[in-house]
């Protein structure tokens, strides 16, 4: 049975030319973590695995950043990197979670972050 | 040991296409790259794409984007390479390779290559 | 894309005798990681490449220490301390850092 949950950054905002950490932790649950997968609409990001360490995907590697800890950082922001993103926890024996992240990329000063929030 | 077995020569007509597959053992198929290498006389080594079997995810060179589909069935831990539309410039020496990713990014185990000829 | 450059083309060398390979890239291979993804392949004749350095010097397991790579940024030299008979082959160099990856032209070496 699937006991644990997923909390992440929630809805955030980052303005153009900046950068921003996605960050999400895997709670109420002894699974162990066996690797997180970073996606942004089936495109994939990044790939830690508990072993290996970190994969960078090549079209990222330039604006890609792993961590800190099992969170990514993204770099030189532009409008079109405003979507979802998605943190695919495969753990043992559990199975797998998967947290959602909106991103919005603003061209004006303006860019507060939004509230955290779980999902089950 | 790590191993790949690829499939043997193919000799086809022009303008059909051709699946190539390549069978890895001695390490766990889902968590590293599995790689494709074009070897023409004359031309040296081409990088064609990579695949991940843990979750499908692929990169093309451009070069190779719409000529060859890289797929990979996790079950009997086969990668598989179409090349389609095929041209005489098509014959070629294609191997697969392990990529391990994650912090060293190189080819570490290398198939036995197949050999395809394209002629009418 | 990153263009690597060998040469020389063929290396004729006489068994105990030192060889060496340069290959350069059009662009620094030092990636935003601090790393530089440089690596040397052999293909035997009749046989499929065989990794023998990565990480510009790192030697794969089983590689004669007889081996070193160096280099940094766009200049990088594979060394054979004393070429043996195994040694024979086409030697590549091929880099990580940059999307798509790319490799040298080969660089033949052959026995005196």
């Known amino acids: 049975m699937m006991t644990g949950t997923i909390e992440t950054t929630g809805n955030i905002s980052a303005e153009k030319g900046g950068s921003i950490i996605l960050q999400c932790h895997l709670s109420s649950t002894t699974a162990q973590v066996t690797q997180v997968n970073w996606e942004q609409q089936d495109q994939l990001l990044a790939i830690c695995n508990a072993d290996l360490g970190w994969h960078i995907s090549p079209s990222f590697k330039d604006r890609v950043a792993p961590g800190p800890g099992l969170g990514l950082t993204l770099q030189s922001l532009t409008v079109n990197d405003t979507g979802e993103y998605f943190c695919i926890y495969h753990t043992y024996p559990d199975g797998t979670y998967t947290g959602r992240i909106f991103l919005e990329v603003l061209e004006s000063s303006v860019a507060e972050h939004g509230a955290r929030f779980q999902i089950p | 040991q790590v191993q790949l077995q690829q499939s043997g020569a193919e000799l086809v007509r022009p303008g059909t296409s051709v699946k190539i597959s390549c069978k890895a053992s001695?390490?766990?198929?889902?968590?590293?790259?599995l790689g494709w290498v074009r070897q023409r006389p004359g031309h040296g080594l081409e990088w064609i794409g990579d695949i991940y079997p843990g979750g499908g995810y692929t990169n093309y060179n451009e070069k190779f984007k719409g000529k060859a589909t890289l797929t990979a069935d996790t079950s009997s831990s086969t990668a598989y390479m179409q090349f389609s539309s095929l041209t005489s410039e098509d014959s070629a020496v294609y191997f697969c390779a392990r990529d391990y990713g994650y912090d060293v990014y190189a080819m570490d185990y290398w198939g036995q290559g197949t050999s395809v000829t394209v002629s009418s | 894309d990153v263009v690597m450059t060998q040469t020389p083309l063929t290396l004729s060398v006489t068994i105990g005798q030192p060889a060496s390979i340069s290959c350069k890239s059009s662009q620094s291979l030092l990636d935003s990681d601090g790393k530089t993804y440089l690596n040397w392949l052999l293909q035997r004749p009749g046989q499929s490449p065989k990794r023998l350095i990565y990480l510009v010097s790192k030697l794969d397991s089983g590689v004669p220490d007889r081996f070193t790579g160096s280099g940094s940024g766009t200049d990088f030299t594979l060394k054979i301390s004393r070429v043996e008979a195994e040694d024979l082959g086409v030697y590549y160099c091929?880099?990580?850092?940059?999307?798509?990856?790319?490799f040298g032209g080969g660089t033949k070496l052959e026995i005196k």
């Open positions: 001695g390490y766990t198929f889902t968590i590293h790259w």
């Open positions: 091929w880099q990580g850092t940059h999307f798509p990856r790319t």
